[in-house]
């Protein structure tokens, strides 16, 4: 009998956020289905997301295992067992990913505003030290874990009353910031990795403003 | 054309084990799907358990816990141990190779029956 119409996989892309990182592809599947497989430059090939009609894989348990590596992965294409097809040895379809360092790559998530405390004309703001996938003596570490001092935040804050921001810099979880008293603020923060040459900054946090149940007030 | 043949059918009685093995006449890429379908008499033919070349295995619901697939890459072998057996799993069980096609084997009959 003849042969299938297997397509190679197309338009692969990583999907990545604090380290949560999905493989997607294309196309939907007809009659085939598809194996991921990953792989460090000098590691071997690891199956995953096997024998599946998904379009998408998550290869989030392998690339936390060490982050700063570059990972490649493949996705193969075979006709679904169903399909009679009978056709000379040949090895199956498969396309490769770009490569992909999450350390380098991973998109930062958007932060939040954990709480901000005034005492008199200072402000403390405290960002949410978000916990990712990435494990090291089996407990999660967090972003501020994994990334050290390349991970800066950047708040941003103005006045109720006015449109007019000011930025602060930090490279912990919280900002001290001078304020007028009797003014209320609201802030804003952005995750920030200087050093980067791709996805740079997050998206910035929801803005909390002073008179809200986050903040707490002190002469 | 890459020939696949399979051995260790018979009849058992229910509740009983068979292994079946498949080997391929050429040397198959750890690249290549290998595995077993069944076809039961009058019906269509069903997958069964799939492997990858490292060893990542699927299951068909009807099978997860009674059977198990194996393979040995360097003998370009595949197994299937069949335990608990019961009638419903009387059926041609065809080995299969899926690289750029699919390659089937012949078939070999399994019986379960008292």
């Known amino acids: 009998s003849g042969t299938t119409n297997t397509v190679a996989a197309y338009n692969l892309t990583w999907k990545s956020t604090n380290f949560k990182t999905i493989l997607e592809w294309e196309p939907k599947p007809v009659n085939q289905v598809y194996t991921v497989q990953i792989s460090t430059k000098s590691g071997d090939w690891k199956s995953k997301c096997f024998y599946t009609t998904d379009t998408e894989c998550d290869l989030t348990d392998e690339i936390v295992k060490d982050v700063k590596q570059t990972y490649l992965a493949r996705v193969f294409s075979y006709p679904a067992g169903n399909v009679e097809s009978t056709g000379s040895a040949g090895e199956p379809l498969y396309e490769n990913s770009p490569e992909f360092t999450p350390y380098l790559e991973t998109n930062l998530g958007q932060p939040t505003i954990q709480s901000f405390e005034q005492v008199g004309t200072k402000v403390n703001v405290t960002v949410e030290d978000e916990r990712t996938l990435v494990r090291r003596n089996n407990t999660f570490l967090s972003l501020r874990d994994v990334f050290g001092k390349d991970l800066i935040y950047t708040l941003y804050y103005w006045k109720s009353s006015s449109s007019g921001k000011k930025t602060a810099k930090t490279n912990t979880n919280e900002f001290l910031i001078d304020v007028d008293k009797g003014e209320n603020y609201c802030f804003s923060v952005q995750a920030v990795i200087p050093s980067r040459t791709v996805n740079r900054k997050s998206t910035d946090s929801p803005v909390e403003c002073m008179g809200q149940e986050k903040g707490e007030f002190r002469e | 054309q890459v020939q696949l043949v399979e051995s260790g059918g018979g009849l058992v009685q229910p509740g009983g084990s068979l292994r079946l093995s498949c080997t391929a006449s050429e040397t198959i890429s750890s690249t290549y799907i290998m595995g077993w379908h069944r076809q039961a008499p009058g019906k269509g033919r069903e997958l069964v358990a799939v492997i990858s070349g490292d060893g990542v295995t699927h299951y068909a619901d009807f099978v997860k816990g009674r059977f198990t697939i194996s393979r040995d890459n360097a003998k370009n072998t595949v197994y299937l141990q069949m335990n608990f057996l019961r009638a419903e799993d009387t059926a041609v069980y065809y080995c299969?190779?899926?690289?750029?096609?699919?390659?089937w084997g012949q078939g070999t009959m399994v019986t379960v029956s008292s």
């Open positions: 299969y190779a899926a690289g750029r096609w699919n390659h």
